[in-house]
């Protein structure tokens, strides 16, 4: 779970240890602030929960790519 130390900076201290299917993910944001102990990705899931993930993991990178493509594809 992300932690807002001094709003508006949100940091992740632990990463999920379980892969989440991209079907269960709605969006993401990257955490790159120097005020945070580590770089992270925060996924927002289909049930509006925010989950911290390790950007070095392949599934995280693949999920971000997939969500990027979804965003770029106009809904008809």
């Amino acid at each position: 779970q992300p932690d807002a130390i001094n709003a508006p900076v949100t940091c992740c201290y632990n990463f999920t240890n379980r892969k989440i299917s991209v079907q269960r993910l709605a969006s993401y944001r990257r955490i790159t602030s120097s005020k945070c102990p580590k770089e992270a990705v925060i996924f927002k899931t289909i049930v509006a929960k925010e989950i911290c993930a390790d950007p070095k993991q392949k599934w995280v990178q693949d999920s971000m790519d997939h969500l990027d493509k979804q965003t770029q594809t106009p809904k008809t």
Epitope: R18, K19, I20, S21, Q23, R24, T45, I46, V47, A48, K49, I51
Partner: antibody, heavy 119, light 109 residues
Framework: QVQLVQSGAEVKKPGSSVKVSCKAS????????ISWVRQAPGQGLEWMGG????????NYAQKFQGRVTITADESTSTAYMELSSLRSEDTAVYYC????????????WGQGTLVTVSS | EIVLTQSPATLSLSPGERATLSCRAS???????LAWYQQKPGQAPRLLIY???DRAEGVPARFSGSGSGTDFTLTISSLEPEDFAVYYC??????????FGQGTKVEIK
């Protein structure tokens, strides 16, 4: 510890409806779903459908579409399964089971409710 | 709908023997979203394995799951008397369409 407690056994006439409840305690309803699974005597498990309470919409197996209604009341942490136009083949134990909507495995199960359809 | 086919239907073994149960999917099970359950007579099913190979809390180490794609296996390394039961596989790729296998009964030889 999460517990799912189901309503008691029912005996119903063919053509009627039955509504089974499933009350969750010891955990949050927020990002979880409830599935309903039935098991006819001596048979295997059959997924009927499920609901994620915060979505307020349910999904149903094609076989039961139009005959089953699954709902959930977040305020009481209770899920319901109503099956209509009952026939003898609907005699079964009906289970509710919880799943995390981020995944899907059924980690906690109710004790089961026996529904007997007989004239 | 993804159809799961379990084999064999019945497995007759003695305590201490190794049990190998198979579950084959009609389509690719992405993200290895496949679980195994144990059910004893008169009881609700109990989750054993999720994500194809992760043991659920409190499940003994003699139970292990493996596989990906369309072929999955549940192995019980050395059967204990309490392991004689029916085992079901379950796919949960799509939240709107779960399915179960028809079950494998592990009985005492």
């Amino acid at each position: 510890q999460v517990q799912l407690v189901q309503s008691g056994a029912e005996v119903k006439k063919p053509g009627s409806s039955v509504k089974v409840s499933c009350k969750a305690s010891g955990g949050t309803f927020s990002h979880y779903g409830i599935s309903w699974v039935r098991q006819a005597p001596g048979q295997g498990l059959e997924w009927m459908g499920g609901v994620i309470p915060i979505f307020h919409t349910a999904n149903y197996a094609q076989k039961f579409q139009g005959r089953v209604t699954i709902t959930a009341d977040e305020s009481t942490s209770t899920a319901y399964m109503e099956l209509s136009s009952l026939r003898s083949e609907d005699t079964a134990v009906y289970y509710c089971a919880r799943y995390d909507a981020h995944y899907g495995e059924l980690d906690f199960w109710g004790q089961g409710t026996l529904v007997t359809v007989s004239s | 709908e993804i159809v799961l086919t379990q084999s064999p239907a019945t497995l007759s073994l003695s305590p201490g023997e190794r049990a190998t149960l198979s579950c084959r999917a009609s389509q690719h099970v992405s993200d290895a979203y496949l679980a195994w359950y144990q059910q004893k007579p008169g009881q609700a099913p109990r989750l054993l394995i999720y994500d194809a190979s992760d043991r659920a809390e409190g499940v003994p180490a003699r139970f292990s799951g493996s596989g990906s794609g369309t072929d999955f296996t549940l192995t019980i390394s050395s059967l204990e008397p309490e392991d004689f039961a029916v085992y079901y596989c379950h796919q949960y790729i799509h939240l709107h369409s779960f399915t179960f296998g028809q079950g494998t009964k592990v009985e005492i030889k």
